[in-house]
């Protein structure tokens, strides 16, 4: 999906209002210095591309993020403010259904969510630079 035509201001507002709080809740008990950020993003479409991929692509080390509250809200936000996004997400929905039902938060999932927080912060910073 090409995120170029999204309403970035609306996505930022949704992130600050709800998604960020859910991410921080997920990370509760860990310090921001516990994990090194190894990925970043350069502009707003890039940030959303990587956020989407990291949130919904299961990895061998962390297969369950797609069922988390922040992931559901991320999906809803992108569907609302990115024209045509929801039509491209049939496969992602299948991936969410296949994701493990276990609610165990592994260290690797915490690390992945830490990377997500970094990508979202970079998204916000690129918005501030443009304004």
């Amino acid at each position: 999906y090409d995120f170029t035509n999204c309403d970035f201001q609306k996505i930022e507002a949704d992130y600050l209002r709800t998604i960020s709080k859910d991410l921080i809740t997920y990370m509760s008990g860990t310090k921001s210095t516990d994990f090194n950020n190894t990925v970043s993003c350069s502009n707003r479409p890039h940030c959303l591309t990587e956020i989407q991929s990291l949130t919904f692509n299961p990895t061998p080390r962390c297969a369950s993020l797609a069922k988390e509250m922040f992931a559901r809200k991320t999906k809803a936000t992108l569907a609302l403010w990115c024209p045509g996004y929801s039509e491209t997400q049939i496969n992602a929905t299948q991936a969410m259904k296949k994701a493990r039902k276990s609610k165990v938060t592994t260290n690797k999932c915490l690390e992945q969510v830490s990377q997500l927080l970094g990508l979202w912060r970079r998204f916000i910073r690129t918005l501030l630079k443009k304004q």
């Epitope: 990925v39 350069s42 990895t59």
Partner: antibody, heavy 117, light 108 residues
Framework: QVQLQESGPGLVKPSETLSLTCTVS?????????WSWIRQPPGKGLEWIGY???????SYNPSLKSRVTISVDTSKNQFSLKLSSVTAADTAVYYC??????????WGQGTLVTVSS | EIVMTQSPATLSLSPGERATLSCRAS??????LAWYQQKPGQAPRLLIY???SRATGIPARFSGSGSGTDFTLTISSLEPEDFAVYYC??????????FGQGTKVEIK
């Protein structure tokens, strides 16, 4: 400390597919970062080809996108480049590199690929 | 695509002198700029990222500055091992990261 090593044929015929592999040691490629390919024609500057992130997102240089495939084999801690329909203009030193998806902090030593019949 | 133009093409200096290398972007890249050093027969090495942050293990004599379209790499006092080709790279314009054509720093 992470080390990267490119391997593959040094000579490819025009119209064929160039295939290179990068073996990573000292770091698990499924643990973090992105894994990138960059090339440098003899005596010229650098050109970014593309990357694959540890979680599977892939990005290619638009000028090469129709001909490029980057894939990963986590069991061997390797990632690969395929460039189809090559011409003499694809003759270059090909580097693999670790990236945070923005810049490139660790590089292989490079391998020269010549396209010639 | 954003075109990165480096000047001069060649810089002839003596050890101990100050080197000032320029990189100009065809449009603003904010501070999304890196500098690399490449010696003959070797891979490039990251020196500077985010326009002014030194990469791990890079000596303090290397410094970067600038924002928007004009950037500078300064080597405060050239050591013999600093004679090499230097490239800038913009990473503002994903998915089209581009490098400058390079500046060669040679011994005078």
């Amino acid at each position: 400390q992470v080390q990267l090593q490119e391997s593959g044929p040094g000579l490819v015929k025009p119209s064929e597919t160039l295939s290179l592999t990068c073996t990573v040691s000292g770091y698990s490629i499924s643990s973090g970062y992105g894994w990138s390919w960059i090339r440098q024609p003899p005596g010229k500057g650098l050109e970014w080809i593309g990357y694959i992130s540890y979680y599977g997102s892939i990005s290619y240089n638009p000028s090469l996108k129709s001909r490029v495939t980057i894939s990963v084999d986590t069991s061997k801690n390797q990632f690969s480049l395929k460039l189809s329909s090559v011409t003499a203009a694809d003759t270059a030193v090909y580097y693999c590199a670790r990236t945070n998806l923005l810049y490139f902090d660790s590089w292989g030593q490079g391998t020269l690929v010549t396209v010639s019949s | 695509e954003i075109v990165m133009t480096q000047s001069p093409a060649t810089l002839s200096l003596s050890p101990g002198e100050r080197a000032t290398l320029s990189c100009r972007a065809s449009q603003s890249v904010s501070n999304n700029l890196a500098w690399y050093q490449q010696k003959p027969g070797q891979a490039p090495r990251l020196l500077i990222y985010d326009a002014s942050s030194r990469a791990t293990g890079i000596p303090a004599r290397f410094s970067g500055s600038g924002s928007g379209t004009d950037f500078t790499l300064t080597i405060s006092s050239l050591e013999p091992e600093d004679f090499a080709v230097y490239y800038c790279q913009q990473y503002s314009d994903w998915p089209q990261y581009t490098f400058g054509q390079g500046t060669k720093v040679e011994i005078k």
